[in-house]
């Protein structure tokens, strides 16, 4: 039975050229996290964090994605094309798979505020 809950940074806005932290947090379960996948709306994998093997950043994102903090991901040098959905997938034992969603809006404005709050998507 899956008792856990994924909390995420929810909906984020950030400036073009800046960086943003994508965070998901799994709570309310004692399940062991074996792997966390980060992907975009088009199913492109950005990064994988395996409990035994550590982080793997996919080549297409190597220059702009940094692992962490924690199981999160830092996306750098933001472009307008980065606007969209991001998904974290927690593979756990024995619970199974948990998924979270973050929507990122990249703003042209130099006065864009960085806003984020933890929420259940």
């Amino acid at each position: 039975m899956m008792t856990g809950t994924i909390e995420t940074t929810g909906n984020i806005s950030a400036k073009k050229g800046g960086s943003v932290i994508l965070q998901c947090h799994l709570s309310s379960t004692m399940a062991q996290v074996t792997q966390v996948n980060w992907e975009q709306h088009d199913h492109s994998l950005l990064a994988i964090r395996n409990a035994e093997l550590g982080w793997h950043i996919y080549p297409a994102f190597k220059d702009r994605v940094a692992p962490g903090p924690g199981l999160g991901l830092t996306l750098q040098s933001l472009t307008m094309n980065d606007t969209g959905e991001y998904f974290c997938t927690y593979h756990t034992y024995p619970d199974g798979t948990y998924r979270g969603r973050i929507f990122l809006e990249v703003l042209e404005s130099s006065v864009a505020e960085h806003s984020a709050r933890f929420q259940i998507p």
């Epitope: 929810g10 709306h41 969209g84 959905e85 969603r101 929507f103 809006e105 998507p121």
Partner: nanobody, 125 residues
Framework: QVQLVESGGGVVQPGRSLRLSCAAS????????MGWFRQAPGKERESVAA????????YYADSVKGRFTISRDNSKNTLYLQMNSLRAEDTAVYYC??????????????????WGQGTLVTVSS
């Protein structure tokens, strides 16, 4: 309870166009992120296009980019899918879906709360 009813499907020749509509009733349509999905015979359901409640954000599957356009008229409680340059591989049952609330588009079926019954699109010469 939200009700979604698709229309506009039918048989069309390759290269031609169709426009699907999805009429919503029983809810606050203007606050719903919406999407179109399709399921071809023997295949899994896949996302086609999605649009945010305020129409600022849209998503298209790679297979339909440049050919399909999603839009909505919040004053008419209706979602649309304009399909141009249709191909045989576009043949499927097309479903519209709505989510109670949220920011941006939702490209994946798991996030939707309400579904229509579908309309069949057949592309054949």
């Amino acid at each position: 309870q939200v009700q979604l009813v698709e229309s506009g499907g039918g048989v069309v020749q390759p290269g031609r166009s169709l426009r699907l509509s999805c009429a919503a009733s029983g809810g606050s349509f203007s606050s719903y992120p919406m999407g179109w999905f399709r399921q071809a015979p023997g295949k899994e359901r896949e996302s086609v296009a999605a649009i945010s409640s305020d129409m600022r954000f849209t998503y298209y599957a790679d297979s339909v980019k440049g050919r399909f356009t999603i839009s909505r008229d919040n004053s008419k409680n209706t979602l649309y899918l304009q399909m141009n340059s249709l191909r045989a591989e576009d043949t499927a049952v097309y479903y519209c879906a709505a989510r109670d609330s949220g920011v941006g588009y939702y490209s994946r079926a798991q996030w939707y709360d309400y579904w229509g019954q579908g309309t069949l699109v057949t592309v054949s010469s």
